[in-house]
């Protein structure tokens, strides 16, 4: 019968979420181990009845209106391990009478986020918590941390302080937390990290502050454990000095004001003048550091949304483990990776939305690169084998450039064209909006693409055989918005083609699909089709799932194949109700309403019906 009471009970878990409760129920099973009272209207937490449930391990009191904690309210809960008081009103003075939370001997995680707690008050609220591993103080009103803020928490490993208004962290504020490994200080008001000395810390989130400088403490023998550092959305002017952080694996510096130096440092001591754009760029490790090569373990580096105009050769030199590099939304005009073994592990390189005009990739550089994003640049005359040299390249996005593809080996094409043939690893290529005028025969020979997007190249001429060699591999082809009147592509030969986008052209005929193919989605919107005869479309009947036809001058008569699809409902034809067709009298009606006799009346026999 317990399914009919307000709280849901399964095993030893009781959920009383969002029931409008004003107090903790007295009638729950006495051996309850997990109790969720979130989203109610509890205003005070009293030892009775909460203390009735002495077996509790997990207690969720979040999103209530709690402003009063009776002294010793949690005292009887000797097994309590997880306590959430998030999103309550603990900042009101009554919450703190006689010792706040009191001792929490076995609690390992405590969530006090969203309580408008301010600095002095927090110290009165937090009691002894010798087992505490995880503490969230996010979304409060803390302005400073002192060496008294976190006391009696020797086991604390994860501390979340995001979304406060922290401006000041006193020296030694975290000294009493010898096991702290994860620290989230994002969305605060910090302006400078001048003496980072938390050697045991592994994860540090400093995103969304106003940090202008990040400096590690000058401890020559220090062995910093930091592997994950997030400094995105700050006000860094220079790449920070990270030579003391040899274990760094993830580094996010996006959305700053970073410029990289254009020349070598001016002095020999490794302290560089900010006017030169240097902040001890990670080119040499401190003498006492065992690693010898800073950032040599870095796997992920995000420098997007900065003001970088140039990447010095030396900058990439030590990034021997890097797998993901994001340099999008900067001011790069050129990018070079010419050296043998440069960025040997890099799998993804995002250079999109810069001002790139030149790109020089050495014959044996970037040997692991799988994804190269170059959309939104100004690339024009590239060395012909720029991409053919990338032995592992699978995905290439060149949208919004001015790249002209060469033809096949027999028809190389003009100077400045780029070869896309013979790239045996390439699977996905976007050449959208490149002002391509002519796609030459054999352009993709021996490049087994599965996805090719040639959309938004108005006036594109597709030469016979331009897509030759793709018949056995291509699954997605987009030719949208090219003004094509005739399609010089023998589409029925593309046996793997699943999605075909021919929208926004001027096509009025399609080749005949007489044999069964794989096509599932066909987009013909905004073309000049009046008829889709069954003789041409018959081969699609087994595979086609979606057909888009809006914006075509469809004829009401002679479209029996299409009418049959509408009535059978096997193919999802877009906007069925609004698919308009015209009689010879120019009268417009919904195609789904046309009957055979409507066509016979005017002497137009519907041959397909």
């Amino acid at each position: 019968h317990q399914d009919k009471v307000p709280c849901k009970m399964v095993d030893k878990k009781v959920s009383c979420q969002v029931l409008g409760l004003l107090q903790v129920p007295s009638v729950l099973p006495p051996d309850t181990e997990t109790l969720d009272l979130s989203g109610n209207q509890l205003r005070s937490i009293l030892a009775s009845p909460l203390g009735f449930y002495t077996a509790l391990r997990h207690l969720d009191l979040s999103t209530n209106e709690i402003s009063f904690l009776q002294p010793g309210a949690f005292q009887a809960l000797t097994h309590l391990e997880h306590l959430s008081l998030a999103h309550n009103r603990l900042a009101m003075a009554t919450a703190l009478s006689a010792g706040g939370l009191g001792p929490l001997p076995r609690v390992t995680s405590l969530d006090l986020s969203g309580n408008s707690l301010y600095s002095g008050l927090l110290e009165r609220l937090l009691g002894e918590a010798p087992s505490l591993h995880t503490l969230s103080l996010a979304e409060n009103s803390l302005t400073r941390l002192t060496r008294h803020t976190f006391r009696d928490m020797p086991a604390l490993e994860q501390l979340d302080l995001h979304s406060n208004v922290l401006m000041d962290i006193e020296d030694g504020a975290f000294e009493g937390l010898p096991r702290l490994t994860h620290l989230n200080l994002s969305r605060n008001s910090l302006t400078c990290i001048s003496d980072f000395s938390l050697q045991q810390l592994r994860v540090l989130d400093l995103s969304c502050n106003s940090i202008e400088a990040f400096q590690t403490a000058s401890q020559p023998q220090a062995e910093f454990q930091l592997t994950w550092l997030d400094l995105r959305e700050n006000k860094l002017l220079h790449f920070p000095d990270l030579a003391a952080l040899p274990r760094l694996i993830y580094l996010n510096l996006s959305n700053n004001l970073i410029r990289l130096p254009t020349g070598p440092p001016q002095d020999s001591k490794g302290i560089h003048a900010p006017s030169e754009g240097w902040s001890a760029l990670p080119l040499s490790a401190p003498s006492g550091n065992a690693s010898g090569r800073p950032l040599s373990q870095l796997l992920n580096l995000d420098l997007s949304y900065n003001e970088i105009e140039l990447i010095p050769d030396s900058f990439l030199e030590h990034l021997t483990s890097l797998c993901f590099l994001n340099l999008s939304r900067n001011c790069l005009r050129t990018f070079e990776a010419r050296r043998l073994g440069s960025l040997p592990c890099l799998m993804l390189l995002d250079l999109s939305h810069n001002a790139l005009e030149t790109l020089e990739l050495g014959a044996r550089a970037l040997g692991s690169l799988r994804t190269l994003l170059l959309q939104g640049n100004a690339l024009r005359d590239l060395p012909p084998y720029t991409f053919a040299n990338l032995a592992s390249l699978q995905r290439l996005n060149l949208q919004g450039n001015r790249v002209s593809p060469c033809g096949g080996p027999d028809e190389p094409g003009p100077s400045g064209c780029v070869a896309f043939s013979g790239i045996t690893s390439l699977r996905s290529l976007s050449l959208v909006d490149n002002e391509i005028e002519l796609l030459r025969a054999g352009a993709f020979l021996h490049t087994p693409l599965t996805e090719l997007d040639l959309s938004s190249n108005p006036g594109l001429e597709v030469a016979t055989g331009a897509l030759g060699g793709l018949e056995a591999s291509l699954e997605v082809l987009a030719l949208q918005g090219n003004g094509l009147m005739v399609l010089q592509v023998d589409l029925p030969c593309f046996i793997c083609l699943k999605r075909l986008n021919l929208a926004e052209n001027r096509l009025s005929h399609l080749p005949a699909w007489t044999q069964a193919v794989s096509l599932e989605v066909l987009d013909l919107r905004n073309n000049s089709f009046s008829l889709l005869p069954g003789s041409a479309m018959g081969g699609l009947e087994t595979s086609l799932r979606r057909l888009y036809l809006q914006g075509n001058p469809l004829s009401c008569c002679g479209n029996g194949w299409l009418a049959a699809q509408l009535h059978q409902g096997r193919v999802d034809v877009d906007a069925t109700q609004d698919l308009i067709c015209r009689f010879s009298s120019q009268e417009e009606v919904s195609l789904s309403h046309v009957r055979p006799e409507d066509c016979e009346k005017g002497g137009l026999k519907n041959i397909n019906l």
Epitope: K4, S26, P29
Partner: antibody
Framework: QVQLVQSGAEVKKPGSSVKVSCKAS????????MHWVKQAPGQGLEWIGR????????HYHEKFKTKVTITADKSTSTAYMEFSSLRSEDTAVYYC?????????WGQGTAVTVSS | DIQMTQSPSSLSASVGDRVTITCRAS??????LNWYQQKPGGAPELLIY???TLHSGVPSRFSGSGSGTDYTLTISSLQPEDFATYFC?????????FGSGTKLEIK
């Protein structure tokens, strides 16, 4: 099926003590409160108190706090109520009943007669 | 302690009648109200818990309603086996307390 079986009727002298037992079966003993209820002859029902069998924590009606001790033995799934310093007004039928939201199963009752 | 005032204390009715028993708490008990039936010589039996939820096996002619301080037990069509004493009980706040009972007799 759920069953609560209470010990037999008792006749006691004033000032003495009595311990009534209630053996539970057919459910998880520790998952329900065990309540004790008094019914004097021709009278209504009076809640004495309850115990959480898992922890042994008991709650009493103020009126019975000094006279009654409720205990439970998890190993035998048995609850006990001990009445001390018996007086004639303690003559009644005493019921054990399991229950969280409602007392859904009751023992058959134990009649305790206090007489000199 | 929360006082539970039950009325009427006794009631005569005939088979087939519709009968209503009320229970008033001295303060809001948030629907934590139960109804019990007791026949002579027997232990009480739970009929309804949490104001309106029928205990398993209880006939649907029994129903409960109410909120705040005022609660009602209704028997829509009295059957011969329904003649007994009925008690309400609040379980919102310790100590749990019973009403004084309503004795339902054959007219």
């Amino acid at each position: 099926q759920v069953q609560l079986v209470q010990s037999g009727a008792e006749v006691k002298k004033p000032g003495s003590s009595v311990k009534v037992s209630c053996k539970a079966s057919g459910y998880i003993f520790t998952s329900y409160w065990m309540h004790w209820v008094k019914q004097a002859p021709g009278q209504g029902l009076e809640w004495i108190g309850r115990i959480a069998p898992n922890s042994g924590g008991a709650h009493y009606h103020e009126k019975f706090k000094t006279k009654v001790t409720i205990t439970a033995d998890k190993s035998t799934s048995t609850a006990y109520m001990e009445f001390s310093s018996l007086r004639s007004e303690d003559t009644a039928v005493y019921y054990c009943a399991r229950g969280n939201y409602g007392m859904d199963y009751w023992g058959q009752g134990t009649a305790v007669t206090v007489s000199s | 302690d929360i006082q539970m005032t039950q009325s009427p204390s006794s009631l005569s009715a005939s088979v087939g009648d519709r009968v209503t028993i009320t229970c008033r708490a001295s303060q809001d008990i948030s629907n934590y109200l139960n109804w019990y039936q007791q026949k002579p010589g027997g232990a009480p039996e739970l009929l309804i818990y949490y104001t309106s939820t029928l205990h398993s096996g209880v006939p649907s002619r029994f129903s409960g309603s109410g909120s705040g301080t005022d609660y009602t037990l209704t028997i829509s069509s009295l059957q011969p086996e329904d003649f007994a004493t009925y008690f309400c009980q609040q379980v919102n706040t310790l100590p749990f307390t019973f009403g004084s009972g309503t004795k339902l007799e054959i007219k």
